[in-house]
């Protein structure tokens, strides 16, 4: 099941996705697409990186974080109800069938008549790089698999700091991180 994120009409939506490059500059191509991750590539690509740069993008989509250090989280500007749906973040690790695929469900809510900051919005602003594994337990490290010359690990960061936070109760699965190298 995909991880769910929420935003209001007119806000920017934030869909987290991270990996850790093995060494400075050893980047892995990433694609973001609208729709669940297919077997290969991304369907309906909205943004793509190569081994150096963002080399394809569409107008309202960008990577606001430090993507050359592995923060490939997607920002969608000024969302509308039509932006609801599943988005695919695909870390295109070299080798056959080595890609890591993350499906993230974006739910767009109508804008409130009286604008008031929501807890979710406060959280995103306060912890833009927040990652946890599934559930809200202590930080854990789970081996996803081994590949030739590549260790692939799903890691959880900030979980300890947030475990006792009132915000933690409001969070569902908050992103995915893999380590390469």
């Amino acid at each position: 099941s995909e991880v769910e994120y929420r935003a209001e009409v007119g806000q920017n939506a934030y869909l987290p996705c991270f990996y850790t490059p093995a060494a400075p500059g050893n980047l892995v191509p990433v694609c973001w697409g609208k729709g669940a991750c297919p077997v290969f590539e991304c369907g309906n690509v909205v943004l793509r990186t190569d081994e150096r740069d963002v080399n394809y993008w569409t107008s309202r989509y960008w990577l606001n974080g430090d993507f050359r250090k592995g923060d490939v989280s997607l920002t969608i500007e000024n969302v509308t109800l039509a932006d609801s749906g599943i988005y695919c973040c695909r870390i295109q690790i070299p080798g056959i069938m080595n890609d890591e695929k993350f499906n993230l469900k974006l739910v767009i809510k109508p804008a409130k008549v009286t604008p008031a900051p929501t807890r979710q919005r406060d959280f995103t602003a306060a912890f833009p790089r927040m990652l946890t594994t599934r559930g809200h337990g202590p930080a854990e490290t789970q081996t996803l698999g081994s590949l030739p010359d590549i260790n692939l690990t799903q890691i959880s960061t900030l979980a300890n700091e947030l475990r006792d936070s009132r915000l933690a109760n409001d969070l569902r699965d908050s992103g995915a991180t893999i380590r390469i190298g």
Epitope: G25, D53, W57, W62, G65
Partner: antibody, heavy 120, light 108 residues
Framework: QVTLKESGPGILQPSQTLSLTCSFS??????????VGWIRQPSGKGLEWLAH???????RYNPALKSRLTISKDTSSSQVFLKIASVDTADTATYYC????????????WGQGTSVTVSS | QIVLTQSPTIMSASPGEKVTLTCSAS???????LYWYQQKPGSSPKLWIY???NLASGVPARFSGSGSGTSYSLTISSLEAEDAASYFC?????????FGGGTKLEIK
Amino acid sequence: QVTLKESGPGILQPSQTLSLTCSFSGFSLSTSGMGVGWIRQPSGKGLEWLAHIWWDDVKRYNPALKSRLTISKDTSSSQVFLKIASVDTADTATYYCVRTFITTTTMDYWGQGTSVTVSS
Amino acid sequence: QIVLTQSPTIMSASPGEKVTLTCSASSGISSSYLYWYQQKPGSSPKLWIYGTSNLASGVPARFSGSGSGTSYSLTISSLEAEDAASYFCHQWSNYPYTFGGGTKLEIK
């Protein structure tokens, strides 16, 4: 101490090939993440990015000029080269080489620039 | 490609004034890779601000940078005579890398 120094022909004629050399010290292009790029600036105007070459020989070119540009490196002699084919008067500018690093500050060191005039 | 539009093109201000230069991107870019350079006549550009808000070595604390997405700015809290120069924004988030047209800052 990081230094970069550009050298070029100074003056050349339209349709010729411009060859520029960037000689640098204080860093190595064999270091993972390191790169060297070329920027130009016509007199009194803005900056235009031309090309980059990285430690692993990945190359990037300005698409508007890509068909005329060739960037290369000689890591052992700490030099980067840029060739611009079929020059015309619009290529008259000061050419700078710059050091970059992929995950920190880019273009943190610039050469003094070399002036190139294309004239018949 | 990402077009960076700087405004104003030329501005004149008095010592002690607060000055803000803006850089607008045609599409959103990573704030980690939005840079500002200062250039004085006859000299090479100098890295001034990197990653939107980080001051390069030796840059006075009266300078600051901010922004995200498509809108970025460089602010001088109290202008000094030595700040007279041209300022260029630059992005190397998206290929091809691009520069803004520059803002020439003059002192009254």
